[in-house]
Interface confidence: low
């Protein structure tokens, strides 16, 4: 399995963000497919569970992401993305996407660095 994510993502405080994770695999996608998303805070705190998918999506029952994350993937299109709602500044950090699709061997875990910013986004500032 090979994982593809963009290196960084910026999103404005209070908005929603799609954490994009796509993958490739020599094995056909079936009921053995699992997707695990975790979060490492920017301040170096312990890793936290964000989301799990196996046939059906499983949202966290407690913690910071309870009622704030939803499945936005499509396994048949090799898409394991999730949607994170109502972003907060302490959502800053690294989100990891791990896809397992037996009998294919596990690949590198994909990483997205999320920066939650104020209303002005860097992408609106011209190159110096």
């Amino acid at each position: 399995v090979e994982i593809y994510t963009s290196r960084v993502l910026e999103a404005v405080n209070g908005t929603d963000a799609r954490l994009k994770c796509t993958f490739s695999s020599f094995a056909p996608v079936g009921d053995a497919l699992t997707v695990t998303w975790n979060f490492r805070p920017l301040d170096g705190g312990p890793e936290q569970f964000v989301f799990y998918y196996h046939i059906d999506p499983f949202q966290p029952m407690s913690g910071r992401f309870k009622d704030r994350v939803s499945w936005d993937g499509n396994p048949e299109r090799y898409d394991a993305s999730i949607l994170l709602w109502k972003l907060q500044f302490d959502d800053n950090g690294t989100y990891t996407c791990q896809v397992k699709n037996p009998p294919d061997v596990d690949g590198v875990i994909g990483e997205i660095r999320l920066s939650v910013v104020h209303t002005v986004r860097f992408s609106e500032i011209h190159f110096l």
């Epitope: 090979e2 960084v8 796509t22 490739s24 920017l42 170096g44 939650v116 860097f122 992408s123 110096l128």
Partner: antibody, heavy 116, light 106 residues
Framework: QVQLVQSGSELKKPGASVKVSCKAS????????MHWVRQAPGQGLEWIGE????????DYNEGFTGRFVLSVDKSSSTAYLQISSLKAEDTAVYYC?????????WGQGTLVTVSS | EIVLTQSPATLSLSPGERATLSCRAS?????MYWYQQKPGQAPRPLIY???NRATGIPARFSGSGSGTDYTLTISSLEPEDFAVYYC?????????FGQGTKLEIK
């Protein structure tokens, strides 16, 4: 406006050490990992490593472990690259950079020359 | 680490012509980034996530590709486009750059 301002050129002898600074302004310093890239004269770009300004956590390219040390001073929003036991092949321009979604911001570069 | 090979090493064209720069990865990568560098200057971001122009980059620059093969196209060269171009991947650590393509005036 986002700015990364690096310290001036350095001329050092083999075996010496050098510390290059990169002062950030115009954004929240702790929101973005700071990266360092090397460019030897007439050569391409090499990623040295990155540092998380919030907690000082680092990740180095394998070829740059040991003599290359990244650090930050949050109070002054400044990142540092220290190179010890300098060799002639360390002669290069060193850039600090932050990566954002649609744009990268780079310092102006610091030329480090190692010569006896 | 993933090795990026750019071709050609040097491309000699005239203003108004179309430039096609290639970047091939030693193994599949998810996205490609492209930079322009002029002598004595820091690299300038052109294309992010394979096909998106960075802020302020003219529409004549475009990126495409997938897997191991990526392309930067400049539809009609302007005098200020003559420079060195680098591709970069960050699908796996460490991030790596291609060796560069020098675009020179014919």
């Amino acid at each position: 406006q986002v700015q990364l301002v690096q310290s001036g050129s350095e001329l050092k002898k083999p075996g010496a050490s050098v510390k290059v600074s990169c002062k950030a302004s115009g954004y929240t310093f702790t929101n973005y990992w700071m990266h360092w890239v090397r460019q030897a004269p007439g050569q391409g770009l090499e990623w040295i490593g990155e540092i998380n300004p919030t907690n000082g956590g680092t990740d180095y390219n394998e070829g740059f472990t040991g003599r290359f040390v990244l650090s930050v001073d949050k109070s002054s929003s400044t990142a540092y690259l220290q190179i010890s036991s300098l060799k002639a092949e360390d002669t290069a321009v060193y850039y600090c950079t932050i990566y954002t979604t649609a744009l990268d911001y780079w310092g102006q570069g610091t030329l480090v020359t190692v010569s006896s | 680490e993933i090795v990026l090979t750019q071709s050609p090493a040097t491309l000699s064209l005239s203003p108004g012509e179309r430039a096609t720069l290639s970047c091939r990865a030693s193994s599949s990568v998810g996205y490609m980034y492209w930079y322009q560098q002029k002598p004595g200057q820091a690299p300038r971001p052109l294309i992010y996530v394979t096909s998106n122009r960075a802020t302020g980059i003219p529409a004549r620059f475009s990126g495409s590709g997938s897997g191991t093969d990526y392309t930067l196209t400049i539809s009609s060269l302007e005098p200020e486009d003559f420079a060195v171009y680098y591709c970069q991947q960050w699908s796996s650590n460490p991030p790596t750059f291609g060796q560069g393509t020098k675009l020179e005036i014919k």
